[in-house]
């Protein structure tokens, strides 16, 4: 077969080929940020000629053109400056309202390198309607100026701009406009991952946050947890495998879907995942009718087995058939469960379509969506039961209109996106499911995105201050209790001056709480073994503080999961009959378990907890500490089995002021406290300039560094005695 010519350079840009110079290969141009390629792509035809998709005239030279943002077409009840036909990247537009009108939205907006305006649509509103003035986004024209109950407004975009969002919206009885805000965008524009992740995440969190299954009921026979079975989600992942998707991109589609699956299973809801790859025909790799669809490992392994070559005989893009296979799956499940049953009607459905282009065969995908809406009986009351996310990747042949038509339209949410490349998609899926936005006391959730603050990463972390100076750290284990070390409290029982500083989204300094009561382990006595030549002994170094008020859960304040509790069991996705021993076997399951603690400056530092025979050799070093233990004969007199041991190899050592802080591990995107910092043989902060300075121990140091942490699995009776009404403990 003839190959296509190689004189396809783009001045100022680069290109990639999906299948070399052979027929069927897609050539994709890219330009530096702030520029866009024209044309965006070319396809090598079987005749050995390049064809530009959608082009009517002969092949023109590819160039990088400057990105521009659309100008306002009309702005009601106010003025905007400067008045230009379109705006360059970095250019601003400012809005002011006439007297009697209040500006809602952004007074100044800047044109971003992706051809999208930052901020929100500016609206001059006098609050007269039943619904607020819906405004007119930049580049749009609106018809309809009455905002009473039942009134409709319609939107279209000027010139060659593409409308995403709702072209028609209705003022509903609750004072909210139906659908989603329309945005007019350049055909070449795309979304930045940092915008998509929160938008997608917000929408997803709405759906997931509605179904937290832990609910306590008090009964005369003690307490019992009820798992609400009503919260079930069917997630359908549709992965485009057509010719224009390169094998490498398909791998990233798969990886992104795996991330999504991993995250979704970390939520405490019941979920079934379907996986469908498609080109000319769909291939169902996992159906929600299969019991394995509820098992994360099974779902991920079916994703891993998805093969790019499965579709090599039919390389078109049949989005209709892919969506129709979702419809057929729903139909089968409805017949199985019974159309009128709660079991069927209470399932929420989310479809995520990952594609790189427009459908080019099989009919309109919109028809399949209509069938899906019909079978799920989606109306205003049941709008929450279906979410369709249409994500275009590659900004070349992606059809904005089609994506927009497929994506759900919900107030304040976006469901249709175009990303620049698969790398951006991966970033989005990494950050979209930020459970830390949930306001209930779901435990062990930290924001893991790159731009999160230290406190958002470890929102359970608190600082304890006796007076003005900070002295110890601790961890929120509920909305009112903090777990810390007993040795922090050596001033008798007067804790009236003490404060606990908890993370707060409104202040970088956090929020201070008084202590209602301090429960210090009665077994703790640092001088208990003084007559044996053990000058300091840290057995039972554990304390609980009850705060004077409840902490409001937020991105900056949230409890960590305590093992051996029902809350941790849900987070670990373990079966209901699990025991404390099962948790210990799952969390401390190796000779060397990677774990973390939080430094004085808030950053997360790494250690390795030594178990089994490695615990013994880790603890042995204590015999070399002659000041604290002048005539020690048995190391176990000092390092009892209450302690976890770290500090070997490249481990960080905690400073004294980090005592009481959580020693924690990450499992399934959730965090579990297995220990608390107690004592050690080396202080890396001693005499340092500030909280950011730590000194590594010299390699020759005798004894070498070792750190000991109270093992929470060994403190179960005490924890249960004091937290029995706060947490739901599993059998030992």
């Amino acid at each position: 077969a003839p190959s296509c010519p190689q004189n396809v350079n783009i001045s100022g840009g680069t290109f990639t080929l999906s299948h070399g110079w052979a027929p069927g290969s897609l050539l994709t141009y890219s330009c530096p940020q702030g520029l866009y390629p024209s044309p965006a792509s070319r396809l090598c035809k079987s005749s050995g000629q390049w064809q530009t998709p959608g082009a009517t005239r002969s092949l023109s030279k590819a160039v990088c053109k400057p990105v521009r943002c659309p100008a306002p077409v009309s702005f009601e009840n106010g003025i905007y400056t400067p008045r230009l036909g379109s705006y360059p990247v970095g250019g601003n537009v400012s809005f002011e309202c006439e007297d009697g009108f209040i500006l809602r939205g952004s007074p100044v907006r800047q044109c971003r390198p992706n051809g999208m305006w930052d901020g929100e649509t500016a609206v001059c509103d006098n609050g007269a309607g039943h619904c607020p003035n819906p405004g007119i986004s930049l580049g749009a024209v609106r018809t309809g100026f009455r905002f009473g109950h039942g009134d409709k407004v319609r939107y279209r975009c000027s010139s060659n701009l593409v409308l995403t969002g709702s072209s028609e919206r209705e003022c509903q009885g609750n004072g909210v406009w139906s659908g989603t805000e329309p945005i007019c965008r350049q055909p070449y524009s795309y979304d930045f991952p940092e915008d998509v992740a929160p938008a997608l995440g917000t929408s997803f969190s709405h759906m997931l946050g509605a179904t937290n299954p832990t609910q306590k009921t008090k009964e005369s026979l003690g307490r019992k947890i009820q798992i609400q079975r009503s919260g079930h989600l069917n997630l359908y992942l549709l992965l485009d495998c057509s010719q224009s998707v390169s094998e490498n991109d398909f791998l990233i589609f798969k990886e992104s879907a795996s991330l999504m699956v991993d995250r979704i299973f970390s939520f405490e809801i019941n979920v079934s995942v379907a996986i469908i790859t498609f080109a000319s025909e769909p291939k169902v790799l996992m159906s929600v009718l299969n019991d394995n669809s509820r098992d994360m490992t099974e779902v991920i392994s079916s994703l891993e087995n998805a093969n790019y070559k499965d579709h090599e005989n039919g390389t078109g893009t049949n989005t209709y058939a892919a969506l129709n296979s979702v419809y057929l799956m729903m139909n089968n499940q409805m017949r199985l469960l019974g159309m009128e049953t709660m079991a069927w009607q209470e399932i929420r459905h989310a479809i995520i379509l990952l594609t790189d282009g427009k459908s080019n065969m099989g009919g309109s995908p919109k028809t399949a969506v209509d069938h899906i809406r019909e079978i799920l009986n989606i109306n205003q009351k049941r709008n929450d039961y279906l979410d369709i996310y249409a994500i275009g990747v590659g900004k070349l042949d992606v059809d904005w209109r089609e994506l927009n038509e497929l994506g759900s339209k919900k107030d304040g949410e976006r469901h249709a996106f175009i990303l620049q490349d698969t790398k951006a998609l991966h970033q989005v899926f990494e950050h979209m499911l930020d459970v830390s936005k949930l306001t209930d006391t779901i435990c062990g959730v930290g924001n893991m995105s790159a731009n999160a603050s230290d406190q958002e990463r470890t929102p359970w972390h608190v600082t304890i201050k006796p007076k003005s100076q900070e002295t110890c750290r601790g961890a929120l284990i509920s909305d009112q209790w903090v777990l810390t070390a007993a040795h922090c409290f050596r001033d008798g029982n007067d804790h009236s001056l003490w404060r606990v500083n908890v993370g707060d989204p409104k202040s970088q300094w956090g929020k201070e709480f008084l202590i209602e009561k301090a429960v210090i382990s009665p077994g703790f006595d640092v001088f208990a073994k003084k007559n044996q030549g053990i000058l300091e002994f840290y057995g039972d170094d554990i304390a609980l503080l009850k705060l004077a008020q409840k902490v409001k859960m937020s991105t900056h304040a949230r409890p960590i999961c305590l093992p051996c509790t029902m809350e941790a069991n849900l987070a670990l996705r373990r079966p209901q009959g699990s025991t404390c021993r099962d948790h210990e076997n799952e969390l401390l399951n190796k000779q060397s378990v990677p774990a973390h603690f939080v430094a004085l400056n808030g950053s997360k530092l790494n250690i390795n907890l030594k178990m089994g025979v490695e615990w013994t050799s880790c603890a042995e070093v204590v015999s070399q500490e002659k000041t604290m233990f002048p005539n020690l004969t048995d190391v176990r007199e000092v390092v009892t089995d209450q302690f976890l041991c770290s500090g070997t190899q490249e481990d960080e050592s905690p400073c004294k002021g980090e005592s009481g802080g959580a020693v924690f591990l990450e499992r399934r995107f959730r965090f579990f406290q297995v220990g608390l910092v107690s004592w050690g043989l080396y202080n890396p902060c001693l005499g340092s300039a500030d909280k950011n300075s730590r000194k590594r121990a010299p390699r020759s140091k005798v004894p070498p560094p070792r750190d000991f942490h109270i093992n929470l699995f060994r403190m179960q009776p005490w924890l249960r005695q004091h937290l029995g009404d706060v947490l739901n403990f599993l059998p030992l």
Epitope: D491, M628, G687
Partner: nanobody, 122 residues
Framework: QVQLVESGGGLVQPGGSLRLSCSAS????????MGWFRQAPGKEREFVAS????????EYADSVKGRFTISRDNSKNTLYLQMNSLRAEDTAAYYC???????????????WGQGTLVTVSS
């Protein structure tokens, strides 16, 4: 907060000894880690030694290890620094410090004495 007053400084020949004392007011002395810092003319303040609130563990800067000994008497609310084999480079103002956490971060310390001068010279 603990009020601290150092004493015992003076002029001493190289190889000689001195004992510094630091007297603390306030009944909470026994719950504080205590430490000594020093500052030579034109230099930064540096850590010398510390002792835990129990008296059970001590830490020293490498430059003084084996020559200086820190101790405390909780019944007298007093901290000591026994300095032997003194060298010219030990010449500095010596400060006593109290710290509840035991890290003695210079940026956070709020209990300092006014210092006592030690001059090592022949």
């Amino acid at each position: 907060q603990v009020q601290l007053v150092e004493s015992g400084g003076g002029l001493v020949q190289p190889g000689g000894s001195l004992r510094l004392s630091c007297s603390a007011s306030g009944h909470t002395f026994r719950s504080y880690y205590m430490g000594w810092f020093r500052q030579a003319p034109g230099k930064e303040r540096e850590f010398v030694a510390s002792i835990s609130w129990t008296g059970g563990s001590t830490e020293y800067a490498d430059s003084v290890k084996g020559r200086f000994t820190i101790s405390r008497d909780n019944s007298k609310n007093t901290l000591y620094l026994q300095m032997n084999s003194l060298r010219a480079e030990d010449t500095a103002a010596y400060y006593c410090a109290a710290d509840y956490s035991g890290d003695f971060l210079l940026s956070d310390l709020d209990s300092w004495g006014q210092g006592t001068l030690v001059t090592v010279s022949s």
